[in-house]
């Protein structure tokens, strides 16, 4: 059984940096394993080496540790449009990203989907597409922004937010999304 994180932190703080307290003998501090390795056996006693083994293929540790097992490498999720930027090594997890002219949208802290950057047809680029943010478009007169695309005011129904933007006007309409269609 792995002790709760707080207990492990408490135990580690008894030893100098780079060492951890022996689980069976709290008077002994063992050297932590380097990144890319994991703890196979605790050190037998003070001044003796910890038995660390290299992570097997498909697993990694990214920092010094006393883990009993390496962590499994992440897989890029093809169904979310993700591509592999760099493959997993013993000391670094897989890095996933998006293709050129796409951005990441995070549905949650650890799940993102790749979407094409908006081209701002019938408008102009107000802010360029970035790694984690779509292009921000400014629509030409006679168009309103819906789902980050500039749509003709002829498609504006009276019930929608666009009615404010599609009144006769001379100025460009900037980035107020039509909230009535999503």
């Amino acid at each position: 059984l792995v002790p709760p994180l707080r207990d492990r932190e408490k135990r580690d703080s008894v030893c100098p940096q780079g060492k951890y307290i022996h689980p069976q003998n709290n008077s002994v501090c063992c050297t932590k394993c380097h990144k890319g390795t994991y703890l196979y056996n605790d050190c037998p006693g003070p001044g003796q080496d910890t038995d660390c083994r290299e992570c097997e293929s498909g697993s990694f540790t990214a920092s010094e540790n006393h883990l009993r097992h390496c962590l499994s490498c992440s897989k890029c999720r093809k169904e979310m449009g993700q591509v592999e930027i760099s493959s997993c090594t013993v000391d670094r997890d897989t890095v996933c990203g998006c293709r050129k002219n796409q951005y990441r949208y995070y549905w949650s802290e650890n799940l993102f989907q790749c979407f094409n950057c908006s081209l701002c047809l019938n408008g102009t680029v107000h802010l360029s597409c970035q790694e984690k943010q779509n292009t921000v478009c400014t629509c030409h007169a006679g168009f309103f922004l819906r789902e980050n695309e500039c749509v003709s005011c002829s498609n504006c129904k009276k019930t929608l937010e666009c009615t404010k933007l599609c009144l006769p006007q001379t100025e460009n309409v900037k980035g107020t999304e039509d909230s009535g269609t999503t």
Epitope: R77, K78, E79, M80, Y105, Q113, F115, N134, E147
Partner: nanobody, 119 residues
């Protein structure tokens, strides 16, 4: 016309189980990645799980990993969510949806089914 109809929600005690179903029509179900999302009272949408077209390598949110199982039957155009070891914090309206393609919004999703976990 795309239709997604969820069922199987209800009142269950903590530790109990429920199986949600989502009957799909109006599109080629077997060609789409399908998603379960939920909305707890007074909160935003939370991604629960998704499953690709062939039902391999499902994704689960950390909050449901090991307790929920997503599956699909392409011959029946139906998506499922088996929910075990239910907790009070799983109380929410559960929606099934088609994975978006054009942008981060759901074009197609159901009306939802309410799951209440309470003793």
């Amino acid at each position: 016309e795309v239709q997604l109809l969820e069922s199987g929600g209800g009142l269950v005690q903590p530790g109990g189980s429920l199986r949600l179903s989502c009957a799909a029509s109006g599109f080629t179900f077997a060609h789409e990645t399908m998603v379960w999302v939920r909305q707890a009272p007074g909160k935003g949408l939370e991604w629960v799980s998704h499953i690709d077209r062939v039902g391999q390598d499902p994704y689960y949110a950390d909050s449901v990993e090991g307790r929920f199982t997503i599956s699909r039957d392409n011959s029946k155009n139906t998506l499922y969510l088996q929910m075990n070891s239910l907790r009070a914090e799983d109380t929410a309206v559960y929606y099934c949806a088609v994975l978006p393609k054009r942008g981060p919004w759901f074009d197609y999703w159901g009306q939802g089914t309410l799951v209440t976990v309470s003793s």
